[in-house]
Amino acid sequence: KIDACKRGDVTVKPSHVILLGSTVNITCSLKPRQGCFHYSRRNKLILYKFDRRINFHHGHSLNSQVTGLPLGTTLFVCKLACINSDEIQICGAEIFVGVAPEQPQNLSCIQKGEQGTVACTWERGRDTHLYTEYTLQLSGPKNLTWQKQCKDIYCDYLDFGINLTPESPESNFTAKVTAVNSLGSSSSLPSTFTFLDIVRPLPPWDIRIKFQKASVSRCTLYWRDEGLVLLNRLRYRPSNSRLWNMVNVTKAKGRHDLLDLKPFTEYEFQISSKLHLYKGSWSDWSESLRAQTPEEEPTGMLDVWYMKRHIDYSRQQISLFWKNLSVSEARGKILHYQVTLQELTGGKAMTQNITGHTSWTTVIPRTGNWAVAVSAANSKGSSLPTRINIMNLCEAGLLAPRQVSANSEGMDNILVTWQPPRKDPSAVQEYVVEWRELHPGGDTQVPLNWLRSRPYNVSALISENIKSYICYEIRVYALSGDQGGCSSILGNSKHKAPLSGPHINAITEEKGSILISWNSIPVQEQMGCLLHYRIYWKERDSNSQPQLCEIPYRVSQNSHPINSLQPRVTYVLWMTALTAAGESSHGNEREFCLQGKAN
C-alpha cells in the first residue's frame, strides 16, 4: 500500500508479485461516505499507471484487468474526481513482475591457502527482478551441514568463514546453492570435493636468489611455501623479454638450482605452488623477484678497423676503431679496452687502456711492420684479443673491387654493389665496406662506420648512421692475406637540389685567362652528393643567354680556369651546384673585366 488509504482501498489479484506475462485484476473501491457530496453517481474513479490514466468509472468501485506489465515494479494509483474540485488520491499499490530463479550454474568452491576459508561462487542466471534469497549449503561427513544465506540483490558469492583442514584430506564435502523467490525456487547441481580439490595454496613468498662464488653457473632460487605444497612451477625471463622459461619441480622444499641463466642480465622470477599432482589448482604467481646475474669474462672478439694517414716522409697516423661487443658477448660492464701496438721485427710493444672511447689514434714511423691487438675487459676478465697487421689497404691495385655503385634503398639505406677484383677473385678473404660523412676538409674526426662481408658477396646494405640528404664517402676494400685493394664512390640515401650555390671568393687573371676560386657549400646545404659545379658568365647589361662551363665535382677542388672571355669586356659570373635531384639557386654574382690584349 502506498499510503494510509483512508478514503478507499486498492486490491490486486491474484497477487502483488506476478510472473512475467500474467494478468492482474486491480479493484479500487471507496469506503462508505467517502465519495463526492450530493450524488454518488458523480463519483468518477480514475486508475493511473504511474502518471498515465488507464481506466475510469462512475460509481463506488472500479475494476480493471491489466496485462503486459514489464519486468520490475509498476505503481498504480486510484484517484477520485468530483465536479469543480481537484482529483483526490484514494489509494495505490505496487505490482512486482518477475520470473522464478533459474538453476544456479557452475557452482565452484575454493579455499585460498591452508588456513583460508571456504568460499563458493556461482552464476545466478537471468535477473529475476524480484527479491531472491540464496542459501548455500555445505555438507560433510557424519551429517555435518552448514547453511549460510545471502540477501544481496545480486548474490553470487558466499564465504562460509570456516576452513577445511588437511587432517582428513580425502573426506568428501558437497556444496549446493538454492535460489528462492515468491515465484519459485531452484537448486544448483551439487559440487562434491575434498580438501585437496579446493585448497588453492597461497603464492610462495620471501623469494631470494644466491649466486655461489659470484658465478652465474651456480645459482639457487629460494622461497617459502605453505607446509603441504608438493609441486612448484618456476618461471623466469630476462626483464626485456616477453617469453618465459618454465620449470616444474616436485618436492623442491623451497629451493631450486637454475643452470641456464645468462650473465649480467636482469631477470624476473615468479613461483607458483600446488598441493597435489592431479588434484586442486595452482596458486597465483608469487610477486616478482628481480635480480641481476653476475658478470662473466667477455666472449667473442672485437670487430676492429683502422685508417692510415700520411703525415710526412717519416711518419704516419694510425686511427683504430672498434665496435662494442654485444650484450651477450660483453657479459658485464666493459671497464676498458686494452690496445697493444707492436713493431713486429723489433719486438717492442706499447700497451694502453682506453676508457670511454671505441677509437684510438697514434703516430708511428712509416718504416717497419706494425700490428695491433685490441681486447675488452670487464670485472671478470678480458675478451680474446683481435689482432690486425697494419698495411696499406689500397696498395694492391689488382685487388681493387670493380664497378662500385651506391644506390638509395628506401629510407636511410644505401645499397653498395661491386664486382670482384680482376686478380683471382678466389684470393679475396673478405670485403670491408666503409663509410663516413663527406667533409671537404677530409676531417679525420668524422666517425667511421664499416661492415664486413663474406668473399662471395658482391653487395652490402648500409643503414647504420645513415642520414637523409648527407653525402657519404664509401670505400669497398678487398682483403687478401697482408694485401688490400680498394675502390671508392660517393653515395646518399636521399637527395634534393642543393639549397645554395658556391660562393665565389676571388677571380684572378693569369696570362689571358681567369682563375675562379670559390668556397664550398656548407655540408648541411648540399642536400646529398654533389655531381657538378656550373660556372655561368655573360656580358654585363646583355640580355643574351649566359655561357656556362660544367665541372665534375671533386672533393678538394675549389678553383677552375676559364679562358674564353674577351678582354676589356665586363662580365657577370656566378656559380651553381648540382646533385642528381637538380640544380641549386645562384651563388653570389661577381663582375670581372679581363685586362689582357685583344687578338
Epitope: 588456513q115 576459508t117 561427513p141 568463514g161 570456516i162 576452513n163 577445511l164 587432517e167 564435502f173
Partner: nanobody, 115 residues
Framework: QVQLQESGGGSVQPGGSLRLSCGAS????????MHWFRQAPGKGQEWAAT????????YYSDSVKGRFTISRDNAKNTLYLQMNSLKPEDTALYYC????????RGQGTQVTVSS
Amino acid sequence: QVQLQESGGGSVQPGGSLRLSCGASGFTFSSFGMHWFRQAPGKGQEWAATISSSGGTTYYSDSVKGRFTISRDNAKNTLYLQMNSLKPEDTALYYCARDVTGAVRGQGTQVTVSS
C-alpha cells in the same frame, strides 16, 4: 604439535546450564574455524556447532539450535560452548576439534544430564 584441552563438563539436571571451554595451542588459533562434536554412549560422533575464525559466523546442528551458543576468544586461544535448557539426550562426551571431521580433537569432557 596441535593440542586441544576441554574442560567444564559435569552432571546437571534437565533444564540446567553448563559452559564448556577448550584451550588450544600449537597452531595459529585465530586462523582456523573451530568445532564442537559430541559422542553419546554406544553412538557415533555427532557434530554440534561451528564458529568461523573471526567469530563472526556460527553454525548449529538442528538438535542444539536455539539452546547452545558457540563463541571464542582469540586473545586467549580459547573456544567456548554455552549449553542451556539441557536435556537427557544431551548426555555425551563433548570435545572440540580444529578440523571439520573431528580427526584432530581433544580428549573430551563428559556432560551428564539426568534427574
